[in-house]
């Protein structure tokens, strides 16, 4: 913390300029006026401020608002951005787009993806959902920033807004992710042919269930292996050995080169040996010819 | 074939909070989407919500604030419940299996459990 | 959400004659529209999907047309087992909705 002194009478402080880099860390904390500070922000990132100094600005603020920010301060926060932890971020209410633009402008080149995701958050929380215009802004500004959000956040997506996503923005997704933005891009595409259908749906297909891998098999849509390899587990187990040849069409091959990794490695491992020496591509590690498969799923059904 | 079948109380007190479980027997819970429609007394079917096995859900706004849709992919169940109950919920509750075929792309249903029915009621 | 609104709430038909049942909706949900058949103390039964498509099982006498906001279920000649209550559901949208529904009486 910095320590309290008083403010010597020529070093009082009636406006925010250039002449407070020449202030030390403990005059700026004696003679800057947060109330001040906070009304002058959009002057801060013009001033080559050092980082030690920036801290005590900080500070300042952190004192006048201890329950975060008003938006008016975050807007000009620059790159005192830069300062902020996301324990700091989680005070704040942010609506505004342009809010977001300078602070992820500010935060690019920096190791600040904690920070930038707890924004984002923020963000959608204080617009009440992730509309267009955010995802429009996050796809521009912050690439593979969607990806940051938790899946409840993303719940928030209208099927609309789909359509603005880019398959580069799903790069980092993860499962649970896939989940719930999986069926909101099924639904926004339903209506096209199958073939423009597929292009749309591919990024998202990592949160298919099985059913609608198989009903892909039947429409020879050629899956590339990258896509293949980001299904589901649980959803490519359940896939026969034709299912599969049909889905992926001439890039079928390229299992030889994924046997050992999964889903591919999972699912050879529940195939028959015989169906599998029906692709001609060499896999082993099927079924053996000879024994019994009880799939258990279905033991309700048996009892 | 796949079944479903729809199990929980049958009353339950205003200000309470409903329960309900659907078994899926005959196929895996992790092939499709699940969903819970409801219909009071000689009224229309409303929708509440789905869920996927991984537990991502998704329901209808005028119900979303007291709706919590939960599976158990180890019993091959799900759930619902409903919580702040009023007699306007009293309904026969089914769950119901989304038709999940991108060839015909939908968000409609399939199969049906019987349907239980839930009075509220003090 | 989009209403979907059925008329007419009661038909009357004899046996062996053509019903014609309508769905409207308050947007358009292009085709994505399903029928379905309900029968007293049972669960709805799929009909048609897609507006126009018969779900597995359904016999031919069942068509459905329409896309947009104008639909219609056309049962061709009523046997005595179609006398139920038939409801349409629009799925272009969430919330997924229903319209109220459509008896089917024997006159």
């Known amino acids: 913390d910095v320590e309290r002194t008083t403010c010597p009478p020529e070093k009082e402080v009636h406006e925010i300029d250039e002449s407070l880099i020449f202030y030390k860390k403990r005059e700026l904390e004696a003679c800057v006026d947060a109330a001040l500070l906070a009304a002058q922000m959009d002057r801060v990132d013009a001033i080559p401020f050092t980082y030690e100094q920036l801290d005590v600005l900080k500070h300042k603020l952190d004192e006048l608002y201890p329950q975060g920010y008003p938006e008016s301060v975050i807007r000009h926060l620059g790159h005192l951005f830069l300062k902020m932890s996301p324990e700091d971020i989680r005070k704040w209410n942010v609506t505004s787009l342009e809010t977001l633009k300078a602070l992820l402008k500010v935060s690019k080149g920096h190791e600040m993806s904690a920070q930038v995701a707890t924004l984002i958050d923020r963000v959608v929380v204080g617009r009440g959902q992730l509309d267009k215009d955010t995802v429009d802004t996050l796809t521009a500004f912050c690439p593979g920033c969607l990806c940051s959000l938790s899946p409840e956040r993303l719940s928030s997506v209208p099927p609309s807004v789909i359509g603005a996503v880019r398959p580069q923005d799903l790069d980092t997704c993860g499962p649970r992710q896939l989940d719930v933005l999986y069926p909101k891009a099924r639904l926004a595409f339903q209506n096209m042919s199958g073939s423009e259908y597929f292009v749309k749906i591919r990024p998202f297909l990592g949160g298919a269930p099985t059913e609608d891998v198989k009903a892909l098999s039947q429409q020879n849509v050629s899956m590339d292996l990258a896509t293949f390899m980001k299904l589901r587990r649980e959803a490519v187990l359940p896939l026969t050995v034709a299912e599969v040849q049909k889905l992926l069409g001439p890039h079928v091959e390229g299992l030889k080169v994924e046997e050992q990794h999964s889903p591919v490695r999972d699912w050879i491992l529940k195939q028959r040996q015989d169906d599998l020496d029906t692709l001609g591509l060499g896999l082993q590690g099927g079924i053996p010819n000879g024994y019994l498969i009880l799939d258990l799923s279905v033991r309700e059904a048996l009892s | 074939q796949v079944q479903l079948q729809e199990s929980g109380p049958g009353l339950v007190k205003p200000s309470e909070t409903l329960s309900l479980t659907c078994t899926v027997s005959?196929?895996?819970?992790?092939?499709?989407?699940w969903s819970w429609v409801r219909q009071p007394p000689g009224k229309g079917l409303e929708w509440i919500g789905y869920i996927f096995y991984s537990g991502s859900t998704n329901s209808n706004p005028s119900l979303k604030s007291r709706v919590i849709i939960s599976v158990d992919t180890s019993k091959n169940q799900f759930s619902l419940k409903l919580s702040s109950v009023t007699a306007a919920d009293t309904a026969v509750y089914y769950c119901?299996?989304?038709?999940?075929?991108?060839?015909?792309?939908?968000?409609?249903?399939?199969?049906w459990g019987r349907g239980t029915l839930v009075t509220v009621s003090s | 959400e989009i209403v979907m609104t059925q008329s007419p709430a009661t038909l009357s038909v004899s046996p062996g004659e053509r019903a014609t049942l309508s769905c409207r909706a308050s947007q358009s949900v292009n085709s994505n529209l399903a029928w379905y058949q309900q029968k007293p103390g049972q669960a709805p039964r799929l009909l048609i999907y897609?507006?126009?498509t018969r779900a597995t099982g359904i016999p031919a006498r069942f068509s459905g047309s329409g896309s947009g906001t104008e639909f219609t279920l056309t049962i061709s000649s009523l046997q005595s087992e179609d006398f139920a209550v038939y409801y349409c559901q629009q799925y272009n949208n969430w919330p997924l909705t229903f319209g109220q529904g459509t008896r089917l009486e024997i006159k």
């Open positions: 119901a299996r989304e038709v999940g075929r991108i060839a015909v792309a939908g968000w409609f249903f399939d199969l």
């Open positions: 897609g507006a126009s």
């Open positions: 005959g196929g895996s819970i992790q092939n499709y989407y």
